[in-house]
Structure formats: structure tokens, C-alpha cells
Amino acid sequence: NKGTDDATADSRKTYTLTDYLKNTYRLKLYSLRWISDHEYLYKQENNILVFNAEYGNSSVFLENSTFDEFGHSINDYSISPDGQFILLEYNYVKQWRHSYTASYDIYDLNKRQLITEERIPNNTQWVTWSPVGHKLAYVWNNDIYVKIEPNLPSYRITWTGKEDIIYNGITDWVYEEEVFSAYSALWWSPNGTFLAYAQFNDTEVPLIEYSFYSDESLQYPKTVRVPYPKAGAVNPTVKFFVVNTDSLSSVTNATSIQITAPASMLIGDHYLCDVTWATQERISLQWLRRIQNYSVMDICDYDESSGRWNCLVARQHIEMSTTGWVGRFRPSEPHFTLDGNSFYKIISNEEGYRHICYFQIDKKDCTFITKGTWEVIGIEALTSDYLYYISNEYKGMPGGRNLYKIQLSDYTKVTCLSCELNPERCQYYSVSFSKEAKYYQLRCSGPGLPLYTLHSSVNDKGLRVLEDNSALDKMLQNVQMPSKKLDFIILNETKFWYQMILPPHFDKSKKYPLLLDVYAGPCSQKADTVFRLNWATYLASTENIIVASFDGRGSGYQGDKIMHAINRRLGTFEVEDQIEAARQFSKMGFVDNKRIAIWGWSYGGYVTSMVLGSGSGVFKCGIAVAPVSRWEYYDSVYTERYMGLPTPEDNLDHYRNSTVMSRAENFKQVEYLLIHGTADDNVHFQQSAQISKALVDVGVDFQAMWYTDEDHGIASSTAHQHIYTHMSHFIKQCFSLP
């Protein structure tokens, strides 16, 4: 780094709020799409190039001029697995976090022309190619259709779809947000013969209603109504079906075969939480009780003689938790061996750490193939010889991520493939494997600038650097950048990790204001080795504020003892631990304990508000963006996972004593900025409205900002700039900065 240890002698510019808002310094990605075991697509200057992984040579797959006459702005593209067609997406209209509608056209790569007959309708909700060949499944008006050939008519699979009532092949609001993290509820079998799908019924689910003000010319605001089950309310019901796409015909309705949930699920409310094809004719389904400490995996086989699916009770696998809930957020997905007779799955071991267990479909017990006081984050690939996984084992740092391979014939033979590649620069990796895992792209995202490299699985040798962000590195040499410290403190004989974004030329003998950046939701992690250019970068670089984050009880990837500590008790230990962290930080000698602030968004807004309302005396001020204020206002799937039901027999007492509103009186001791989008479909404006009302009722003076028609992300260009400018002013005023 240029410059000197002396801040006054460093003439370089700082990273400003404008730099953040205008994205002056852009991290370069290298987003590839594998199309085979040795080729990938990469977009360069709007040309789509196809690269040979082994040799690195490329050719133009599709010129940027191909669609000059198309007449629409293409939002995304998707190439059929056989490489014959390209699906073009346009007229994109966002719905919720993952869902959107769009228009689609199909381009025939052999004929070099758009297919004009039998087009997919406008406002399609989801489209997906079959895993091989070029069949298409799509959802329109909540019903599923299949195209055997892009130019042939669609076969209608379902006839029951109804807006906000019956969803075929797509998720309703709560399944999208909290279960599948996707709009799609369609699953092709590996060779594209079968199409499995879920059907959600929201008939009895209560509606959240909010105003959408839209253009100034709209005299009466629109009312948005969304089926949204809040904690304890009526939930959607789910059914699961499989259709054989070889059976489809225009002159008879498609026959979908239902696979019912296990008897142990049908006794009460339950969720479908995972669908994984094991083989061409074997499918695994995971079901979860509404009280999310008990799940069942069914393994179902196609019976050709009857055309039905049989799920043997002897093949059911039960997963349960006695200390909390199943999975990090839901039960993990199984990774089946080629024959479909066994699978690997991440589950909690006896010590409460999440590791890989090997299951045989006909046996109840499994064999753990990894162990230790660390956790496996994800299984990334499975071949006949090796299983590849990401874990945070290396150097005992929960906030790190590295790629490992384990030999399936000898579980003691484990190799870290990324640990020693670039240990200073790269401690946080993700990976993208080619179709049969012959090659892989490593994506290093910190602590140094992101680095993308390509590797061969044959000998795990690095083939080439794809992107090293050297141009950005050169630019940042001329900027006074903050440094990042990642360390831990010990509380009650337990390590708790924190990170600090430290101002340039940090001097531990000086006193700095500190902003605690909090999330603190169950299984969260804010202390990590990732490089980021964000609001904190500006605050540290330009305003000389330390921005710290702390992973206390409830946080993830460090075992269930820590994560399940807040089971049935949201708003307790995770809140107390943020206050304790701030106390510990102020004892470190370089924090001005009269200038400590806290801020957070969503769950972080809830924790911020609970902290500020605790009367601890530690914090001068804070900002809560889109906070939860009372758990009965939030959705059933997320809330009940951790809190159970808001009934007297279950956990109503804690629902009622974990509200922000009950702490209103204590806000007289702090400066509070409350922010919310009026069109937040996720954490409803209601939640902040109730905080505001409670504060007004006890005479608390506070600051507030609403963002008209903004959702949970407050992400429109103007609103994004406004909120961060507004929060910057608030923090500077709180810290008495010029």
C-alpha cells in the first residue's frame, strides 16, 4: 500500500459515500455457465463465448449482433442442454425476492432464427429446460405446461391454477421466501422423462394488505393483497405429483400421479421441504412438521407395471432435533450415488456439529465421514471416487471457507484443495464444478480482492487465472482503504468471533467512534473473511468510524450449542450478546465509549431496536431498517422454526415479552432512527408502524423515514442513495462529526 503510517502525510483520497453509492470501484466477477464436462459459456462485451476448460481457447458461441433486430431488451438467456436452442428472457417484472414474470422467445441455433410458432405466453411465471435435450416446462397463470419441442404446442399438465389460491409448479409467498428460496416448484427427472411438481393451496391463508401509491396521478392507491401466513395463522397446504412427459397428448388430459406425505406428517400441519431425484425412476422427498424439529425423508420408486410411485416405509429416514430445529434453515439435501442406493447428507452429529453422513437407503443409521469442532457448509460434487465439500475447518476459523475432497474408499484421506493456494489473499472460497466434476472454478472472495481461477480435478492443478481484479487493485492503491480485523473474544469459556473494519492508519492509542453492524438472526454470520466495498468502507475510510460485527449466541457454523442457544427465545441472548460485545470492544482501549452506535436491517433492525430499548447505557444512538417488532407479525415458517406457536400451551408468553414495543420507555435514553418501505411484503410496514405508535404513546422523540412503494430491500436507485445518505447524516450527527 502506498502512503505512510501517518494519516496527515497521506494525500490519497478516501473511499467516499459517493464512491459507494455510484459504485466507483467495481469488483469484477467471472460468471461462467458450464455446458458440459469440459466447456463453459462466458459473456464478454455481450458476445457469448464458449471456452475449452483444459486449454483455455475460446470461440464465439453467439455474437452480440444476433439479436440487434429483436426489438426487446434481453434480461437473461438460457441454452438448452443439447446446445440446439437458446431461451431469451425479456419484459422482466419483479414480484418478490426470487419470483418474477417475463416474456420468452426461443432461438434455434441450427437454423439461426427465432421460432415464431407456438410461442410461450407473456407473463410466464417460470420456465426451465429439461436436464437433457430440449424439452421445456413452464408455469403460466399458476398452471404447468410442457413443450416436447420448442416449435410444438404446449401440453397442459394442470387445470386447477388460480391466482393467490392454487399454485401449480410455483411457490406461494411463504414457500418462496422460507422453504425453497425459489419461485420454482418443478423438478425434472435426470433424463427429462418425468416432471415432478408441488401444488400449494392458499385458500385459507389470511391476506396481508397494504397500499401501493404508484404514480402521483393515481387518485386512489392500489391495495396489494398477498396470502401470507403469520405466526400461528392458517398455513398453505401442499400436494406433490409426478407426470410422465412421454404420455402427453393433445386429446386427453395429462395424468399426474400423487405421492402423499408420510403418515407421520399427515397427522398435522406440515411442509414439503426438499425434492431430489436419485435416479431416472427414484425420487426423494423430505417433509417437515410445522413444529420444525421432526422431518422425514421418503424414497419413492416408479413402478412401471402400475405407473405409480411407491415409497417404502422401510426406506424412510427420520431426522429430528432435541435442542432446536432440523437443519440450518431446513433439512439439507441428499447427494445420491450413481446407483441411487445410497446418499450423503449434512446432519448434526452427537456433538452438535454439522457433518457429512453416509446413508444406505435401506438402513436407518448412517456413518459420519467427517468430524470435528467445525462444520461442513455444503456438499459441492460427488463422483465415483471423491466427495467435494466446503467447510470452515481450516485454522479453526468459522468465518473462512475452503474446498476439500474426501476419498470415498478411505474417509481418512482428506485433502484441502484451496487452503494453501493463496493463503494471505484467499480464505473464503466458493466453487463451480463442470457437469461431471472434471474441472472446477474456484471463486475466492476475500480477505484480499476477489480471485477467480480454473482447476482440473484429475490432479487438482491450477489451469489458469480467470480474473484477478488487478485493475481494481491498481485503482485502490490510490485510495486510503480501511483494514479488516477478524478475531474472537472468550465469554463463558466459549469463543465468539467478531470483525472490525478499521479506519486507514488505525492507531490503537487513539479513540474512535464505533458502529455495531448487526444481523444476529439464527444461523447468521457477520464475522468472516470476505472482502467488501460497502457503506462500512465509507464510514471507516472517510469518517474514521470503526464498523464492527459480532457473532454471538444463535449464530451459525460453530455447532448447535451456539446456534440453538436461542431456541424458543428470540430477542434474548442474541440481543444481550451484542450489548456485551460493545462493552468488550469499549474495553479494548481504542473505542470512544461515549460514541457507540448500532444499526441493522430486518432481523438486524429487530436486534438494534431491542438493544436500544434495553436501557443498557452502552449505545448513544442507532438505526433500525425494516425491523421486526413483534414475532406474531412475521411469517409462520421462519418464526415458528425458532419460537414454536403463539399459543398458551406452547410459547405465547415469550412471543409477548420479546416485542420492541414493550421497551418503548427506554428509547428516551437513546437517539433512534426508524426506517421502513411502505410496500415491504416481507417485514410488513405494520411492524414499524407499531414501534412508532408505542414510542409516540410514551412521548419518545425519535427520527423516522418511510420509503414509498419500496419493499424489504429499499433497492431502487433513488431510494438506495437516499437511505444511505440519510443514515450517514444521522450517524455523523450522533458522533458529532463535521
Epitope: L152, S247, E304
Partner: antibody, heavy 116, light 107 residues
Framework: EVQLVQSGGGVKQPGETLRLTCTAS????????VHWVRQAPGKGLEWVGV???????DYDAAFMSRVTISKDTSKSTAYLQMNSLRAEDTAVYYC??????????WGQGTTVTVSS | DILMTQSPSSLSASPGDRVTISCRAS??????LNWYQQKPGQAPRLLIY???NLHSGVPDRFSGSGSGTDFTLTISRLEPEDFAAYYC?????????FGSGTKVEIK
């Protein structure tokens, strides 16, 4: 390899019952429908009916009262039964595999002659 | 029922000739039309499905076109083995119906 092998034709008396067999190999009768058509001497093709993969049946109205199409999936066999045969039922009868909206494989045909 | 009318009922042509056969539906059948070839003493075989799509293994001298009610089968250069009967068939609605056939004979 997909194949449809037919049997059961021959000479029938008027009023008798006809039972034709179509044995499939290389595919499953629970996946694909099997259609039956017939072709009178020197004439065109006439659709009789179908049994779908899930066992449902559809018939041409002209044959509804005296035709039954069935199958035994364990034997991979489809059947056409026609009652009350008359001279005009004399034809070559074909079974075919239904592939979406077309017939991609045909049986070799079986000749039925109704004569007193 | 949907009536399928084929024309001509027969035609004479020589090898190398271009031949077109028409098929008309009594109502709109979109593109749900198939063409079959039948040689004497044999079962019919699929040539074209869904108006214009060539079935696998069928020579590309065969082509189909049309939509709605009017359809055409074209043989661009007649080969000796193409002398046979040709049938159209609608697949949009039960009962399925066939055209009465066109016999292509050697001139």
C-alpha cells in the same frame, strides 16, 4: 427396440366376438397409449379407439356400443374386443403406439374377415 | 367429428417429379396434423408430425406445411420407393380422423 406384434385375426361368423392382441416390447403400456385403427379392403384408415397409459379409454362413437379396449400391463399386451361382428367389420386391424399426438410405431396388422 | 378431405385421390408422376398433396380440415386444427405413408401389404409409417416436423429416419425430400385448415405434403424429388398411398390425420380432437388417402402411382 420398440415393437408391436399383433395376433388374433382370422375368419369370423357374423354375430361372433373378435378379440385381437397387441403385444408391446421396448416400451411400457403405463407410459404410452395404444390406439386401434382399421382399414377395410381398398379403403382408408378408420380410428376405433385408444387405451391410455393410465388405463382410461376413448372410442369412436360408431364403435362405442360393441368395442372394448383393455390391457394387461404385466404382459405388455393390449386387447381389442369387438362384439356382434358384421360383414362390414371385415378389415385389417392395426394397433399403434401413441407418441404425444402421432403414431410412431405400428403393428404389422391383422386381417379379420367376417363371413358366413 | 372433424372431416379430413384429401386431394387428389390419386396422381401419376415420374421419378424426379415434385409432388404436392393437399389435405383440408372441416375446422381449425391449428398445426395438429400428421402424414403417413402406406405401401401395399404394409402398415402405415409416420412421415411428418405436427404439420411440418420430419419424423426421424424420413428423407428430407418430404416436407409438410400449413396450419388451420389447409395443409400440404410435398415430395421434392420423387424416388421409386415413394410410390405409395399417403394419409393425413388430425390429432387435435377425438375421434381422431384420417383423410381418405392419395395414391401416388408411376406414370
Amino acid at each position: 427396440e420398440v415393437q408391436l406384434v399383433q395376433s388374433g385375426g382370422g375368419v369370423k361368423q357374423p354375430g361372433e366376438t373378435l378379440r385381437l392382441t397387441c403385444t408391446a416390447s421396448g416400451f411400457s403400456l403405463t407410459t404410452y397409449g395404444v390406439h386401434w385403427v382399421r382399414q377395410a379392403p381398398g379403403k382408408g384408415l378408420e380410428w376405433v379407439g385408444v387405451i391410455w397409459g393410465d388405463g382410461r379409454t376413448d372410442y369412436d362413437a360408431a364403435f362405442m356400443s360393441r368395442v372394448t379396449i383393455s390391457k394387461d400391463t404385466s404382459k405388455s399386451t393390449a386387447y381389442l374386443q369387438m362384439n356382434s361382428l358384421r360383414a362390414e367389420d371385415t378389415a385389417v386391424y392395426y394397433c399403434m403406439r401413441n407418441r404425444h399426438d402421432w403414431f410412431d410405431y405400428w403393428g404389422q396388422g391383422t386381417t379379420v374377415t367376417v363371413s358366413s | 367429428d372433424i372431416l379430413m378431405t384429401q386431394s387428389p385421390s390419386s396422381l401419376s408422376a415420374s421419378p424426379g417429379d415434385r409432388v404436392t398433396i393437399s389435405c383440408r380440415a372441416s375446422q381449425d386444427i391449428r398445426n395438429n396434423l400428421n402424414w403417413y405413408q402406406q405401401k401395399p401389404g404394409q402398415a402405415p409409417r409416420l412421415l411428418i408430425y405436427y404439420s411440418s416436423n420430419l419424423h426421424s429416419g424420413v428423407p428430407d425430400r418430404f416436407s409438410g406445411s400449413g396450419s388451420g385448415t389447409d395443409f400440404t405434403l410435398t415430395i421434392s424429388r420423387l424416388e421409386p420407393e415413394d410410390f405409395a398411398a399417403y394419409y393425413c390425420q388430425q390429432s387435435i380432437k377425438l375421434p381422431l380422423t384420417f383423410g381418405s388417402g392419395t395414391k401416388v402411382e408411376i406414370k
